[in-house]
């Protein structure tokens, strides 16, 4: 059997086909999910669906072959096999391996640790989100890229705010948490506040009393 | 009415291998999912492997996944069941059987004896 | 994956007399797909029933299936000597599919 890979994201509607033609007059064509447990059925001129997870979400086209699965989710996740009994009695099948990904949800930057080494500012921040698998990269004023969950940089003086940003990703989605930090770098922690993604419509900041104070006054 | 007549059985050590084939007589084999059913002494029936009347996909049973693989000759009417790393309790009577419509099991070989032993 | 449970596990009467053996599934059978067979010693099972309630070519009418959902129940009517045996069910509604422990019909 052929075996092709998809991948979605959830909640999409999704069309399983094949990309050749089915054989000619078949007598019978069968869609299962895993090995054996069948979704549809097509035989003499009629579609019969099987009591399953996807019945009510699911439509068989008999002249392509092609299975249309509404709102996909996680639990969708399955190798789908169509069979066709040909007229000589024999099957031909095809497999398509469906994966089913949740988009990434927005990351969160958390300062793991921040301090003076020789005049310098040592910054040490990670991305966080919940459970998932995912692909890191982080984007800014940086020697070379990242691409994990922590980002750890040296900061030579400077008397404007660096950004950096993290951005997460699967196959099916990204999303971008951004982090600015503003000197000087030993600024108490409690003279800063984290402002939400929200707030700063898109950003995510770590940013001193009095910018703050500014902030909300604009 | 097809037969279905298993070979291949017989004593092996924990740890080795054994192959069991099913030669199929009076059918069009290759119109015909199959599968392998086992039955330890003494208790009830636990299907092992299945395999698609094409031979293009197999499913076997979480207990021999990694270690058993069920395939197909059409051109010989021959299914098999390969065993490796073979254990104590994967000692039983292996019957082949055609995996009928892909829903029941119909009809059975008479079946193969594997004993695992030391 | 789906448990079946069948009951009693032996069964103990006369010919003649009527059997009703139960097969209990943890979950709903989907479409009420399961089946009987009958097993033996030293031989093969055999198909008796599938979808629930239809016989297998060249079965006799004494056996027949009922049930739906979780309850299903193979009667037969009036045991004949070669009816002695030990009696499975098999659900093919979900994967895997799965066998009941057994009941044996043995003679009184």
């Known amino acids: 059997g052929r075996l092709v890979h998809m991948t979605v994201v959830s909640g999409s509607n999704v069309t399983l086909n094949i990309s050749e033609s089915l054989p000619e007059n078949y007598k019978q064509l069968t869609w299962f999910y895993t090995f054996d447990q069948k979704i549809v059925e097509w035989d003499s001129g009629k579609s019969k669906y099987f009591e399953s997870k996807f019945k009510g979400r699911v439509r068989l086209d008999p002249q392509s072959g092609a299975l249309y699965i509404s709102k996909v989710q996680k639990e969708d996740n399955s190798t789908y096999v169509m069979r066709v009994l040909k007229k000589d009695g024999y099957e031909q099948e095809w497999k398509i391996k469906l994966q089913v990904l949740d988009p990434v949800p927005k990351p969160v930057i958390k300062i793991e640790k921040r301090e003076d080494v020789d005049d310098n500012c040592y910054l040490k921040l990670s991305c966080v989100i919940p459970g998932e698998s995912v692909n890191y990269t982080w984007y800014g004023e940086l020697p070379k890229e990242i691409q994990n969950s922590v980002l750890e940089t040296t900061l030579k003086p400077h008397k404007h705010s660096r950004c950096y940003t993290c951005q997460v990703s699967n196959s099916v989605s990204s999303k971008n948490g951004t982090f600015c930090f503003s000197p000087p770098c030993t600024a108490a922690r409690s003279e800063q506040k984290l402002i939400s993604e929200e707030d700063l419509g898109g950003e995510q900041k770590l940013i001193s009393e009095e910018d703050l104070h500014h902030h909300h006054h604009h | 009415e097809g037969q279905l007549l298993e070979s291949g059985g017989g004593l092996a050590q924990p740890g080795g291998s054994l192959r069991l084939s099913c030669a199929a007589s009076?059918?069009?084999?290759?119109?015909?999912?199959m599968s392998w059913v086992r039955q330890a002494p003494g208790k009830g029936l636990e299907w092992v492997s299945l395999?698609?009347?094409?031979?293009?996909?197999?499913y076997h049973a979480d207990s021999v996944k990694g270690r058993f693989t069920i395939s197909r000759d059409n051109s010989k009417n021959t299914l098999y069941l390969q065993m490796n790393s073979l254990r104590a309790e994967d000692t039983a009577v292996y019957y082949c059987?055609?995996?009928?419509?892909?829903?029941?099991?119909?009809?059975w070989g008479q079946g193969t004896l594997v004993t695992v032993s030391s | 994956e789906i448990v079946l449970t069948q009951s009693p596990g032996t069964l103990s009467l006369s010919p003649g007399e009527r059997a009703t053996l139960s097969c209990r599934a943890s979950?709903?059978?989907?479409?009420?797909?399961l089946a009987w067979y009958q097993q033996k010693p030293g031989q093969a099972p055999r198909l008796l029933i599938y979808?629930?309630?239809s016989r297998a070519t060249d079965i006799p009418d004494r056996f027949s299936g009922s049930g739906s959902g979780t309850d299903f129940t193979l009667t037969i009517s009036r045991l004949e000597p070669e009816d002695f045996a030990v009696y499975y069910c098999?659900?093919?509604?979900?994967?895997?599919?799965?066998f009941g422990q057994g009941t044996k019909v043995e003679i009184k």
């Open positions: 098999q659900q093919y509604g979900s994967s895997p599919r799965t």
């Open positions: 395999i698609s009347g094409s031979g293009g996909s197999t």
């Open positions: 979808d629930a309630s």
């Open positions: 979950q709903s059978v989907s479409s009420n797909y």
């Open positions: 059987a055609i995996y009928n419509n892909y829903n029941w099991f119909d009809p």
């Open positions: 009076g059918i069009t084999f290759g119109r015909y999912a």
